[in-house]
């Protein structure tokens, strides 16, 4: 599908809408300015007409007032000021605040736990397959295959540390060279960014929130993809990462350090280990071609075992097969040798839900996948709700200013680098970039953090996860120390190189522009977000994997034309936006292509048709849930439901629950206030600290 040309600063006629132009798309007005509306108007722009950026129409038909969808929403304070409260009100408000904080921490805890369980679920569902990806011998010679294996395995096990540790053990066992491991590490870096993209999908209910959250999550993806796009060919050509890291490893005489501190795991492990415990060694064993491991279950059954090392006598076909000449003897018929055998005696079973069910890994994984996604979604909704009610008025202003404001001139440029350090530090504390970036996603969604600020935080997170790996490497046993340290350093320098490429000069901050573009498209066509996830994290890697297995001739035969077309489209797009006059009239816009090749509208129709059959079924359920939810939150007129319900409600006579459009949802008070149902000083529901 050809990309859509970006307009300059000019805004086309609202009736002539441009898809995918970062920062151009007008959306629902600011919530604070909202009037009572029950119609489900999407962004006011509907018709699609691709105009060249130099068109005069774009300059003439400028709308009077355009809201930049990337501007942070102003969450108005609807509560009584602290000074105006009586003692009882102040006490009540104080305890409400404490309650909210406890709830927030509680939901945050279960959010992090559900991410851990999600990772375990993915490992149960796809861990063995992931292990088998590694046992492919072509990895050694094909860096592209190594890259996609890194992506696929990390996506399948939902943990870059798991895939990295498999790589380390394979390098330590000489099954893999450091050179072959580098593309896998790059792939793992890409794969780990799927987690916060999944988290962003949970915010699909509110269009503007989803726009920001999805862009905030995919900025990580684009940074990783772009870094690989540039640095993988550079690494293949120069082996700079391998050389630099080798020099570092050889110049220092490292002694085994201590384990990297498990800070967050200490809190979450007591809970997550009650749900499920995995034997992660199985994936590594499969990766190392251990046939016996293929039949082992990943679900840990025995937690307390006694390992007894003993020597047993075994027969060998000939004396040449003896362990050593001195450990070789005969009974007159057969040759014998002595073999060290480790007997594992099971003492105590693990204490988790699935220990006695003896279900296949796939079944346990599927159950956990569904449950963890439900908990993740629930926690996310609650976190967003609590933050939405807390972050209003002065509180929001203070927080937003603190996070998003730059240092005074001439030190403004330092702010981003401080954010990188903060991101690295926070990731080091929580010991997981997935957890940090996933926690960041809803904050971007509700508008506490701008994408411009989230970007360096995410880059810092990438660095933070590598410092954890370096510490873990220093704690490795002697034989694995060198390889694990070199791989951890490769990971570190890869991310540093990426930051140098895509951060210091504002012009090069392509990931932000690309993420905003994707955010715009996904906000209009929400199915595109899922499509993006499947394409970038599954289909493309699987296609490259398949083509690589078919041989390098097939890979080149298919790859070269594809790359050529992509480059051609990019060049054409660049010329269209910068100097269109050099192009023939036909090529000055994309109108020469059929609509389905230049617009998502026809595809949207197909998707809508496909999903339409589910809507009626889902609506009945949705309405029941909706009413239950409304009763729980004590607001008979704030029902949050999907468009299908609204259509159903409108079709019915005597409707009693007005339904609000999904893109205009916000905190309860604001919605009710906007509809003119509650006075601004309704202190029963809202309490503001400042």
């Amino acid at each position: 599908m050809a990309p859509w040309p970006e307009l300059g600063d000019a805004q086309p006629n609202p009736d002539k809408y441009l898809e995918g132009a970062a920062g151009q798309q007008p959306t629902a007005p600011d919530k604070s300015k909202e009037t009572n509306k029950t119609d489900n108007t999407e962004a006011p722009v509907t018709k699609i007409e691709l105009l060249p950026s130099y068109s005069t129409a774009t300059l003439i038909d400028e709308p009077t007032e355009v809201d930049d969808p990337w501007n942070l929403p102003t969450l108005q304070d609807s509560g009584i000021k602290w000074s105006e409260r009586d003692t009882k009100g102040k006490i009540l408000c104080f305890f409400q605040g404490i309650g909210r904080l406890i709830l927030l921490l509680g939901f945050l805890y279960f959010f992090v736990c559900s991410l851990d369980i999600l990772s375990s679920a993915f490992q149960l569902v796809g861990g063995k397959m992931a292990g088998q990806f590694f046992s492919n011998s072509s990895i050694m010679s094909n860096p592209l295959l190594g890259l996609v294996i890194g992506v696929l395995v990390t996506v399948l096990v939902q943990s870059s540390s798991t895939s990295t540790s498999i790589v380390v053990s394979m390098v330590s066992s000489s099954l893999l060279t450091v050179r072959a491991a580098i593309p896998i590490i790059m792939g793992a870096n890409i794969g780990t960014s799927i987690t916060n993209t999944i988290v962003a999908l949970m915010q699909v209910g509110d269009r503007s929130e989803f726009r920001r959250a999805f862009a905030g999550a995919t900025v990580h993806d684009f940074f990783n993809w772009l870094s690989v796009l540039v640095l993988l060919p550079v690494e293949v050509a120069t082996h700079y990462l391998e050389i630099i890291t080798q020099l570092i490893v050889e110049s220092f005489h490292f002694k085994n350090g201590e384990d990297a501190p498990d800070l967050l795991k200490v809190i979450t492990k007591p809970f997550t280990k009650l749900i499920v415990q995995l034997d992660k060694k199985v994936i590594s064993q499969i990766a190392m071609n251990d046939e016996k491991a293929k039949n082992k279950s990943l679900v840990k059954i025995w937690c307390k075992t006694f390992t007894n090392k003993t020597q047993i006598n075994v027969t060998v076909p000939s004396t040449a097969n003896c362990t050593s000449p001195s450990l070789c003897w005969t009974d007159g018929i057969q040759n014998w040798t002595m073999k060290n055998v480790t007997y594992k005696e099971n003492i105590a079973k693990c204490q988790h839900i699935f220990v006695n069910f003896h279900l296949p890994d796939l079944a346990v994984g599927t159950i956990l996948l569904i449950l963890s996604l439900l908990v993740l979604c629930g926690c996310l909704i609650m976190i967003v709700k609590i933050l939405g009610s807390v972050l209003k008025g002065q509180v929001a202003t203070v927080i937003k200013k603190t996070i998003n404001t730059d240092f005074p001139f001439p030190f403004a440029w330092l702010t981003g680098y401080l954010a990188i350090l903060v991101g690295a530090g926070m990731t080091f504390i929580v010991q997981s970039s997935s957890v940090f970036t996933s926690a960041l996603t809803p904050l971007i969604g509700i508008g506490v953090i701008t994408i411009e600020r989230a970007y360096p935080l995410t880059l810092g997170s990438n660095i933070g996860t590598t410092t954890t790996a370096i510490l873990a490497a220093l704690a490795s046993p002697g034989n694995a120390l060198r390889s694990s340290l070199q791989i951890a350093l490769c990971h570190f320098f890869f991310n540093i190189s990426g930051i140098l490429l895509w951060y210091p000069i504002p012009f090069t901050r392509l990931p932000i522009r690309m993420a905003k573009g994707l955010g715009n498209i996904s906000a209009k066509y929400r199915w595109f977000a899922v499509f993006y996830l499947i394409i970038f994290f599954f289909l493309i890697p699987l296609t490259v994997f398949g083509l690589s297995l078919a041989g390098w001739r097939v890979l080149v035969g298919v790859g070269v034309p594809v790359v050529f077309i992509i480059i051609l489209v990019l060049c054409l797009r660049l010329l269209q936006s910068r100097c269109p006059r050099v192009l023939p009239k036909k090529l000055q816009n994309w109108n020469f292509l059929p609509l389905w090749m230049r617009s998502l509208k026809p595809w949207d129709a197909v998707v809508s048709k496909f999903t339409g059959c589910f809507q009626m079924r889902c609506c009945c359920c949705c309405r029941v849930c909706c009413r239950a939810c409304c009763l729980l939150c004590d607001c008979p007129k704030c029902c949050r439901c999907s468009k299908c319900c609204e259509d159903l409600e409108e079709a019915q006579e005597g409707q009693d629950v007005p339904v609000k459009a999904p893109e205009t949802f916000d905190n309860i008070t604001i919605s009710r206030e906007a509809q003119g149902e509650v006075p601004a000083s309704d202190s029963k529901t809202e309490c503001t600290a400042l």
Partner: antibody
Framework: QVQLVQSGAEVVKPGASVKMSCKTS????????MHWVRQAPGQGLEWIGA????????SYNQKFKGRVTLTADKSTSTAYMELSSLRSEDTAVYYC?????????????WGQGTLVTVSS | DIQMTQSPSSLSTSVGDRVTITCKAS??????VAWYQQKPGKSPKLLIY???TRHTGVPSRFSGSGSGTDFTLIISSLQPEDVATYYC?????????FGGGTKVEIK
């Protein structure tokens, strides 16, 4: 207790064959390897070969290969050794022995021996 | 084949004396060595296996040591009933081979 009773002395002509027996009792015949060792008058011990009665697997000293055949009859718990193409230097006491020290070639129970005299 | 060379071929000593018999293998046999005692007109009797493990019923005055290629049998205090020929045997490789024997006599 473990007992290995060998057949009586034999006097044979050069070029002929001799088949001696070793009847066992006091243990499970098929459990242990049966070794055959000979000792020429005033000389040291020389290992001929071994058989595992359980499977009939045999192992021979290259020096005797082709001339010696070891067999075992599980029904009677008896082991046999046949030596063909006898020469005067084959005159010796032939012992059957077993190794109850599992997996080793150290033999701990011996028969009383069968004296074979090769003489024209 | 592995050659086992025993020395001395014979020795004559007094009751109560310490007797040392050595056995040298032509190649590394680890610890797969056994020692036998054979009295005149009798079948051999196993004394020691795995270089130093005494067989059931063997008096403690008999001990063995060594590894690789050099092995020793020691009778710490010679008794009249110990008069016999002593053989070492390797069971590291097929064929099993014996030493030439050491004849122990009492003066």
């Amino acid at each position: 207790q473990v007992q290995l009773v060998q057949s009586g002395a034999e006097v044979v002509k050069p070029g002929a064959s001799v088949k001696m027996s070793c009847k066992t009792s006091g243990y499970t015949f098929i459990t242990y390897n049966m070794h055959w060792v000979r000792q020429a008058p005033g000389q040291g011990l020389e290992w001929i070969g071994a058989i595992y009665p359980g499977s009939g697997d045999t192992s021979y000293n290259q020096k005797f290969k082709g001339r010696v055949t070891l067999t075992a009859d599980k029904s009677t718990s008896t082991a046999y050794m046949e030596l063909s193409s006898l020469r005067s230097e084959d005159t010796a006491v032939y012992y059957c022995s077993i190794s109850t020290i599992i997996t080793t070639g150290a033999v701990d129970y011996w028969g009383q021996g069968t004296l074979v005299t090769v003489s024209s | 084949d592995i050659q086992m060379t025993q020395s001395p071929s014979s020795l004559s000593t007094s009751v109560g004396d310490r007797v040392t018999i050595t056995c040298k293998a032509s190649q590394d046999v680890g610890t797969a060595v056994a020692w036998y005692q054979q009295k005149p007109g009798k079948s051999p009797k196993l004394l020691i296996y795995w270089t130093s493990t005494r067989h059931t019923g063997v008096p403690s005055r008999f001990s063995g040591s060594g590894s690789g290629t050099d092995f020793t049998l020691i009778i710490s205090s010679l008794q009249p009933e110990d008069v016999a020929t002593y053989y070492c045997q390797q069971y590291s490789r097929i064929p099993l081979t014996f030493g030439g024997g050491t004849k122990v006599e009492i003066k």
